[in-house]
């Protein structure tokens, strides 16, 4: 069942069917005998009870006050009263834009990230049984879609999808043709979830080592799921049997990003491992960032300023 009209302030466009549904509907059915009344007040006017005789455009059904259609002079405050239950709405009826297929003030804005799932479904559950056809327009040009009962767009968003999408439902009531328009302003933005990957720590690291011993070089980064982190060393990786790239460790951060760590293990350090660059690179769609490690013999430590050392 269609949910009740809980918003106290409502703006609608003239010339369209419209309804107000009070929020104690289930209760009203239980107390069939209870007197239920709808009232309107506008400006200085006192509460005027509404009934089908007030206007040929107004219809009352159980919990609903219907307008066929709503017009500018319907602007005002509406009240539903039943026993000690009262619900109030303030209705503002605005002019239809005669030069467009939609009225700018009645547009719902949505932001969709490029390449993310994008969906527009033309549905109207309240008037569903009365709707005989529905059309979907983009920037007031009709889109040719298969389903003319509930036209739908389902796709991965492209920048070209940006625009105003209007669902127009055509329906008959008492021999008259009406239409209801619902417009979405779709803005396509770049993927906001991606971060620029960051390699943690200094860009250049001198590591003091002893010949014959082992060392573990730790490269850590904050990155996106699809970003890669890898070590580059020597002419061709893997040429030195004493150098091993350990399995990458990844931990998801509370923000949905990843903290990655990749260790390069150098065993039985020899002269050939000294004073050469061991580069750790993080690559993303935005580019690459690199940090470098240089192994330095402990005896040579005095030649290098203390702040460039890592352990």
């Amino acid at each position: 069942a269609e949910s009740c009209t809980s918003r106290p302030h409502i703006t609608v466009v003239e010339g369209e069917p419209f309804y107000l549904k009070h929020c104690s509907c289930s209760l009203a059915h239980e107390i069939e005998t209870t007197t239920k009344s709808w009232y309107k007040s506008s400006g200085s006017q006192e509460h005027v009870e509404l009934n089908p005789r007030s206007s040929s455009r107004i219809a009352l059904h159980d919990c609903v006050l219907e307008f066929w259609p709503v017009e500018l002079n319907d602007t005002g405050s509406y009240f539903f009263q039943m026993k000690n239950y009262t619900q109030k709405w303030k209705l503002n009826v605005i002019r239809r834009n005669k030069h467009s297929c939609f009225t700018e003030r009645q547009v719902t804005s949505k932001i969709v990230e490029v390449k993310k799932f994008f969906q527009i479904t033309c549905e109207n559950s309240y008037y569903q049984t009365l709707v005989n056809s529905t059309s979907l327009y983009k920037n007031c040009k009709k889109l040719l879609l298969e389903n003319n009962k509930n036209p739908t767009i389902k796709k991965n968003a492209e920048f070209e999808d940006q625009g105003y999408y209007s669902c127009v439902h055509f329906l008959h009531h008492n021999g008259k043709l009406f239409n209801i328009t619902k417009t979405f302003n779709i803005t396509i933005v770049e993927d906001r979830s991606n971060i620029v990957p960051v390699l943690l720590g200094p860009k250049l690291n001198h590591v003091a080592v002893e010949l014959g011993k082992n060392v573990r070089l730790n490269c850590s980064a904050l990155l996106n799921e699809e970003d890669v982190i890898y070590w580059m060393f020597g002419e061709e990786n893997g040429s030195d049997p004493n150098i091993h790239e350990e399995k990458e460790m990844r931990i998801m951060t509370p923000e949905g990003k990843w903290h990655a760590s990749k260790v390069l293990r150098i065993e039985n350090i020899g002269e050939s491992n000294l004073n050469v660059l061991y580069n750790c690179t993080v690559a993303s769609t935005g580019g690459t960032d690199t940090k470098s490690f240089i192994l330095v013999r402990k005896a040579d430590m005095a030649d290098i300023p203390g702040h460039v050392f890592t352990r």
């Epitope: 920048f159 770049e190 991606n194 620029v196 799921e225 699809e226 890669v228 982190i229 890898y230 399995k247 990458e248 990844r250 990655a260 690559a283 993303s284 769609t285 935005g286 580019g287 690459t288 960032d289 690199t290």
Partner: antibody
Framework: QVQLVQSGAEVKKPGASVKVSCKAS????????ISWVRQAPGQGLEWMGW????????NYAQKLQGRVTMTTDTSTSTAYMELRSLRSDDTAVYYC????????WGRGTLVTVSS | DIVMTQSPDSLAVSLGERATINCKSS????????????LAWYQQKPGQPPKLLIY???TRESGVPDRFSGSGSGTDFTLTISSLQAEDVAVYYC?????????FGQGTKLEIK
């Protein structure tokens, strides 16, 4: 509109240099790296290198190392590729492309190297 | 460098028939840490820049007809056109973006039989 607009065709003598520009619009320039890809007449695609717009880091193909320089100007959202010491086999269409899978390409710039 | 090898070099297929292009990488382009495959497919028509069709080995780029599909993992990949249309005549390239240099296959020329 999301696009990469490249500079016009160039004719150069062997030994000269060429600088091709690629102006980006419709997206955040610093969010994507820019690659340069070339295609000699009737040949396949050759990746020349790329530049990380957000930090200026570059990676060049080994065979072009020392002859190629890639730069960007973030104030104008423009990427540049300079190739020096041109040879006749550098005659090709030079493309700029966005990201690491190239979802956006420039139209290409024909560089002809001829004496 | 990762070497990408496509087969066949050229292919002739009848309209409405299935076309299959293979691509082999000299080392894996599957990243175990996130289980993603760093492989893309492009279509290039004469006088035009290449156009991205598939990325992550099997994700179709927005706007690309669903007759195009990509499959494979590790080192062996396939681009399939389920029902060849006249406008599909082009050269197709695979490319790895797992490690720099980001290398392309030599290309496969697709024609109508």
């Amino acid at each position: 509109q999301v696009q990469l607009v490249q500079s016009g065709a160039e004719v150069k003598k062997p030994g000269a240099s060429v600088k091709v520009s690629c102006k980006a619009s419709g997206y955040t320039f610093t969010s994507y790296g820019i690659s340069w890809v070339r295609q000699a007449p009737g040949q396949g695609l050759e990746w020349m290198g790329w530049i990380s717009v957000y930090n200026g880091n570059t990676n060049y193909a080994q065979k072009l190392q020392g002859r190629v320089t890639m730069t960007t100007d973030t104030s104008t959202s423009t990427a540049y590729m300079e190739l020096r010491s041109l040879r006749s086999d550098d005659t090709a269409v030079y493309y700029c492309a966005r990201g690491w899978y190239f979802d956006l390409w420039g139209r290409g710039t024909l560089v002809t190297v001829s004496s | 460098d990762i070497v990408m090898t496509q087969s066949p070099d050229s292919l002739a297929v009848s309209l409405g028939e299935r076309a299959t292009i293979n691509c082999k990488s000299s080392q894996t382009v599957l990243y175990s840490s996130n289980n993603k495959t760093y492989l893309a497919w492009y279509q290039q028509k004469p006088g035009q820049p290449p156009k991205l069709l598939i990325y992550w080995a099997s994700t179709r780029e927005s706007g690309v007809p669903d007759r195009f599909s990509g499959s494979g993992s590790g080192t062996d990949f396939t681009l399939t056109i389920s029902s060849l249309q006249a406008e599909d005549v082009a050269v197709y390239y695979c490319q790895q973006y797992y490690r720099t240099p980001y290398t392309f296959g030599q290309g496969t020329k697709l024609e109508i039989k």
